[in-house]
Interface confidence: low
């Protein structure tokens, strides 16, 4: 399906609004430090050029690839060298190396100020004054902070953002209407970004075979009535979509995602009975709905897996003929029967099955050798089951904040070399698994918990890759995607770690503590907790609890004082001294 002009093809397929939005996202994800106005200018120039190509596909430069056109445009930015340093060297390369170079310079933790939310009236005025600029600014600010955000999904978020303002800026109580909607979009957006980051890591670090295996397992759970051939087709198409988005090919990605949604809706009968309500929605909402659709009911009459995968004498013959297809079918059959398992567990089982066949099909009596293969799955299944049970019990006993603190201590002891902000961010998010998953029925707990933990631990891996400090983290992150979580779970106290010297400045607090939100106060306390563990990795739970209780009392006392700053100045050194004594 070749076109004389790729840019004209995509402009016509996507329409001007989506085309401009996606180009803005692409540019913002590549040049994360550039001012908004600069990106808008570049996008307008690209759009005007695309229109000339739509009018005449033979016009000059219209036959160039999108990477060439976009890369040339990015390389016109005057301040590239001073703003981005060595990223400017990308511009000396030819395609496709230039795009690869830009991709390698995407920064998962850009040095950008946290987004502050202005007063509701200020936001509503800005929305009414220039709706288009207001929405572009949203795309820009999210994309530059989340350089792997799934671009077509970001357009869906922007549509919801627009709808929230359109509705709430007319409301009697604007704030009561708008703020919960913005909170929900923020939280969903962060989750969506993290989930997509894992997909991109899977593709980029472990290859499309790893991503396809993940997709086979997940889609087989969602669509247990679909035939293997149907699931395989969806997996192939989905892999193409995510490969494109993760590779910065956002126009192709959005176009192919729309085609996939169209295909799924035209073939509902052979996929799932749950797609109907999604398929009545407009494009962005439809694609989102299809991605989030609940699992269909399992067919009632599924036979035992043992017949084809253990008892059959043809197992090795079938495996040898087409290894990946046979393993894919095994994964499909296992996953459609087990919506109660995490995708990562299903992939571990498939890996274990593959290892057994590799060993046994070379043995004197293959059948005898692999006859007990399903028994070997038992410990693999029990490990995450027990982990979820224990952690949910702990969560129910402690509540979210203290559960997070328990994880902070646990992970700081495992990998104390990791930076404190990263440990705080990751442990806080690990701790959110409790509220997210522990309230669910037993059959949904493991898939919720373990697959969520995989997303959070990927964030640790991504941040650690940027600034590697721990061999243990590198090992867990790079050896096996499916075993990352068990690898981290198995880490013990790092005996080789040399405790951090005590720095009183780290435990010096001021009156600004008192005006912080509850969340910000928690982060401050949790930061102090990590620093305490880094200083005294062998401190007991009781010792740490004593210091944290003391800290809470000290902050509460000073925040009630008339002269807060004086109180912090006077009580702070006492708190530090008491803490050192308690940990000695």
């Amino acid at each position: 399906d070749t076109h004389k002009s790729e840019v004209a093809h995509r402009f016509k397929d996507l329409g001007e609004e989506h085309f401009k939005g996606l180009v803005l996202v692409a540019f913002s994800q590549y040049l994360q430090q550039c001012p908004f106005e600069e990106h808008v200018k570049l996008v307008n120039e690209v759009t005007e050029f695309a229109k000339t190509c739509v009018a005449d596909e033979s016009a000059e430069n219209c036959d160039k690839s999108l990477h060439t056109l976009f890369g040339d445009k990015l390389c016109t930015v005057a301040t590239l060298r001073e703003t981005y340093g060595e990223m400017a060297d990308c511009c000396a390369k030819q395609e496709p190396e230039r795009n690869e170079c830009f991709l390698q310079h995407k920064d998962d933790n850009p040095n950008l100020p946290p987004l502050v939310r202005p007063e509701v009236d200020v936001m509503c005025t800005a929305f009414h004054d220039n709706e288009a600029t207001f929405l572009k600014k949203y795309l820009y600010e999210v994309a530059r902070r989340h350089p792997y955000f799934y671009a077509p999904e970001l357009l869906f978020f922007a549509a919801r953002y627009k709808a929230a303002f359109a509705e709430c800026c007319q409301a009697a109580d604007k704030a009561a209407c708008l703020l919960p909607k913005l909170d929900e979009l923020r939280d969903e957006g962060k989750a969506s970004s993290a989930k997509q980051r894992l997909k991109c890591a899977s593709l980029q670090k472990f290859g499309d075979r790893a991503f396809k295996a993940w997709a086979v397992a997940r889609l087989s759970q969602k669509f247990p009535k679909a035939e293997f051939a149907e699931v395989s087709k969806l997996v192939t198409d989905l892999t193409k979509v995510h490969t494109e988005c993760c590779h910065g090919d956002l126009l192709e990605c959005a176009d192919d995602r729309a085609d996939l949604a169209k295909y799924m809706c035209e073939n509902q009968d052979s996929i799932s009975s749950k797609l109907k309500e999604c398929c009545d929605k407009p494009l962005l909402e439809k694609s989102h709905c299809l991605a989030e659709v609940e699992n269909d009911e399992m067919p009632a009459d599924l036979p035992s897996l043992a017949a084809d995968y253990v008892e059959s004498k043809d197992v090795c013959k079938n495996y040898a003929e087409a290894k990946d297809v046979f393993l894919g079918m095994f994964l499909y059959e296992y996953a459609r029967r087990h919506p109660d398992y995490s995708v990562m567990l299903l992939l571990r089982l498939a890996k274990a099955y593959e290892a057994t066949l590799e060993k046994c099909c070379a043995a004197a009596d293959p059948h005898e050798c692999y006859a007990k293969v399903f028994d070997e799955f038992q410990p693999l299944v029990e490990e995450p089951q027990n982990l979820v049970k224990q952690n949910c019990e702990l969560f129910e006993q402690l509540g979210e904040y203290k559960f997070q603190n328990a994880l902070l201590v646990r992970y700081t002891k495992k990998v104390p070399q990791v930076s404190t902000p990263t440990l705080v961010e990751v442990s806080r998010n690990l701790g959110k698994v409790g509220a997210k998953c522990c309230k669910l029925p037993e059959a949904k707990r493991m898939p919720c918990a373990e697959d969520y933990l995989s997303v959070v631990l990927n964030r640790l891996c991504v941040l650690h890759e940027k600034t590697p400090v721990s061999e243990k983290v590198t090992k867990c992150c790079t050896e096996s995607l499916v075993n990352r979580r068990p690898c981290f779970s198995a880490l013990e106290l790092d005996e080789a770690y040399v405790p951090k010297a005590f720095n009183a400045e780290t435990f010096t607090f001021h009156a600004d503590m008192c005006t912080l939100s509850e969340k910000e106060k928690q982060v401050k306390k949790q930061t102090a907790l990590v620093e305490l563990v880094k200083h005294k990795p062998k401190a007991t739970k009781e010792q740490l609890k004593g210091v944290m209780d003391n800290f809470a009392a000290f902050v509460e006392k000073c925040c009630k004082a008339d002269d807060k700053e004086a109180c912090f100045a006077e009580e702070g050194p006492k708190f530090v001294a008491a803490s050192q004594a308690a940990l000695a």
């Epitope: 502050v116 202005p118 001021h510 009156a511 600004d512 005006t515 700053e565």
Partner: nanobody, 115 residues
Framework: EVQLVESGGGLVQPGGSLRLSCAAS????????MAWYRQAPGKGLEFVSR???????NYPDSVKGRFTISRDNSKNTLYLQMNSLRAEDTAVYYC?????????WGQGTLVTVSS
């Protein structure tokens, strides 16, 4: 509500110095953070420096070592001492303040660095 008024801008030669002031009035007891931002012609807003009520400061690399932020709580005034000025420091400088983030802004004072 907090009102902020900047002063001290003007024309200065490259390598020269300038001291900006920002006088705060109104509900200043709620102010915990004060900061300077700047906007060069045709560019976006850029963070220059911040100081908390406790006195801790931070600066981006572009001004670190050349600019110093300070505040006199008794006079409710924020200062920015700018040394070794460069042509690229030309901008409108804004004072900003707030309890948790900088929600109150001044009107700005123009600094031009040119020979």
């Amino acid at each position: 509500e907090v009102q902020l008024v900047e002063s001290g801008g003007g024309l200065v030669q490259p390598g020269g110095s300038l001291r900006l002031s920002c006088a705060a009035s109104g509900s200043i007891e709620s102010i915990n953070r004060m900061a300077w931002y700047r906007q060069a012609p045709g560019k976006g807003l850029e963070f220059v420096s911040r100081i908390s009520k406790g006195g801790s400061t931070n600066y981006p690399d572009s001004v670190k070592g050349r600019f110093t932020i300070s505040r006199d709580n008794s006079k409710n005034t924020l200062y920015l001492q700018m040394n070794s000025l460069r042509a690229e420091d030309t901008a409108v400088y804004y004072c900003a303040a707030g309890p948790v983030w900088e929600q109150f802004w001044g009107q700005g004072t123009l600094v031009t660095v040119s020979s």
